[in-house]
Interface confidence: low
């Protein structure tokens, strides 16, 4: 650009565009400066004066170079089932993600809108698919020869111990009980303890329920177990 138009505001050449970190102001018909992240346009440019920028107020932010008249409001505080993985600053919004042991049942552009606790498989059921940041645990009934005696979101069905003499046969929720001599345990593939997933950023996923063996239970639920101390996240 010629020297006389190197400083904003300036009129762009016919068919030309404004430079990086500048915007074209329709009213002034000039290329004017954008405001940096953490600031907003307090006074718009004219033909003779450039944009006047000002810092964002508390609990507001701008993440990009901009010419917005007001900074954006940071999201509400994270609920008790979430952790704040990014604080609200003048340059970035607060990001809430689900805390460990929870998964994101309803995402938003950044972070998670609604967390749900990972389902716990009841005795007689083991983890078929472990929970992730965005999906619930899926439980399955323990197959013959395997059992789970725990209420857990990580334990899979384990093989019954093999007895020389069986005192009490095992079932889906109880290991076999041997009489006296030392038992051996059959080596079923994948008989391992699954790690608890750690929540980070998340995307939308459909809640996936899982069976339980609770007597007389019924309503088939799309979200996992919820402890008393759960925060409200709203839809």
């Amino acid at each position: 650009l010629p020297a006389q138009v190197a400083f904003t505001p300036y009129a762009p050449e016919p068919g030309g565009t404004c430079r990086l970190r500048e915007y074209y102001d329709q009213t002034a018909q000039m290329c004017c400066s954008k405001c940096p992240p953490g600031q907003h346009a307090k006074v718009f440019c004219t033909k003779t004066s450039d944009t006047v920028c000002d810092s964002c107020e508390d609990s507001t932010y701008t993440q990009l170079w901009n010419w917005v008249p007001e900074c954006l409001s940071c999201g509400s505080r994270c609920s008790s089932d979430q952790v704040e993985t990014q604080a609200c600053t003048r340059e970035q919004n607060r990001i809430c993600t689900c805390r460990p042991g929870w998964y994101c049942a309803l995402s938003k552009q950044e972070g998670c809108r609604l967390c749900a606790q990972l389902r716990k498989c009841r005795p007689g059921f083991g983890v078929a698919r472990p929970g992730t940041e965005t999906s619930d645990v899926v439980c399955k009934p323990c197959a013959p020869g395997t059992f789970s005696n725990t209420t857990s979101s990580t334990d899979i069905c384990r093989p019954h111990q093999i007895c020389h003499v069986v005192a009490i046969p095992g079932n889906a929720s109880m290991d076999a009980v041997c009489t006296s001599t030392s038992p051996t345990r059959s080596m079923a593939p994948g008989a391992v303890h699954l790690p608890q997933p750690v929540s980070t950023r998340s995307q939308h996923t459909q809640p996936t329920p899982a069976p339980s063996t609770a007597p007389g239970t019924s309503f088939l639920l799309p979200v996992g177990p919820s402890p008393p101390a759960e925060g409200s996240t709203g839809d």
Epitope: K120, Q206, P207, P209, L221, V223, P228, E230, T233
Partner: antibody, heavy 116, light 110 residues
Framework: QSLEESGGRLVTPGTPLTLTCTVS????????MIWVRQAPGKGLEYIGF?????SAWYASWAKGRFTISKTSTTVDREITSPTTEDTATYFC?????????????WGPGTLVTVSS | AYDMTQTPASVEVAVGGTVTIKCQAS??????LAWYQQKPGQRPKLLIY???TLASGVPSRFKGSGSGTQFTLTISGVECADAATYYC????????????FGGGTEVVVK
């Protein structure tokens, strides 16, 4: 353990109406609540539910038309701007959010009539 | 998503006969289906959950079966007390659905 809906009455179209489901012998910090309605001579229609922490999910048709909220012993469901199509018996039902949950516990229902 | 289609809308059966009610989901809901019985002026009563598990206190003449998208409620040895409307209900996803219930089936006992 019991549930009882209240607040059902005759209202004119556009008049906001709040229905309350009062629980007895149930800990709403571990139980969730579902709202269902039934127009005269029609089937059951799911409205939405609220989880123990207070987060609410709604049927797609009910978003913006209904608001569900709760206290420690009650769950409220507001019809923001009732129309004659909202005339129905409204039920609340509770279930354990652990495992399947349990909806054998339903309130008797409360009748809402929207008429000019 | 997860629309529930219940058939027939109405069925007539003689005492001692058998009734079959079908419920179809528009997408797989695995085994997350419950059946309810409702009589006029009363609240719904749970009969079966997780597709085939009988709820406490429900007579064994009620039987649920199916998985995925196709489900069936069978009432064998029908009694006069079984005259009611029966609803299926999916429990796989409540987040963005129109209704979790089927349209209902009226059972008339002759």
């Amino acid at each position: 353990q019991s549930l009882e809906e209240s607040g059902g009455r005759l209202v004119t179209p556009g008049t906001p109406l709040t229905l309350t489901c009062t629980v007895s012998g149930i800990d709403l910090s571990t139980y969730a609540m579902i709202w269902v309605r039934q127009a005269p001579g029609k089937g059951l229609e799911y409205i939405g539910f609220i989880r123990p922490g207070g987060s609410a999910w709604y049927a797609s048709w009910a978003k913006g038309r209904f608001t569900i909220s709760k206290t420690s012993t009650t769950v409220d469901r507001e019809i923001t701007s009732p129309t004659t199509e909202d005339t129905a018996t409204y039920f609340c039902a509770t279930y354990d959010t652990y495992g399947y949950g349990d909806t054998r516990l339903w309130g008797p229902g409360t009748l809402v009539t929207v008429s000019s | 998503a997860y629309d529930m289609t219940q058939t027939p809308a109405s069925v007539e059966v003689a005492v001692g006969g058998t009734v079959t009610i079908k419920c179809q989901a528009s997408e797989s809901i695995f085994s997350y289906l419950a059946w309810y019985q409702q009589k006029p002026g009363q609240r719904p009563k749970l009969l079966i959950y997780y597709a085939s598990t009988l709820a406490s206190g429900v007579p064994s003449r009620f039987k649920g079966s199916g998985s995925g998208t196709q489900f069936t409620l069978t009432i064998s040895g029908v009694e006069c007390a079984d005259a009611a409307t029966y609803y299926c209900q999916q429990g796989y996803d409540f987040s963005a659905v129109d209704n979790v219930f089927g349209g209902g089936t009226e059972v008339v006992v002759k």
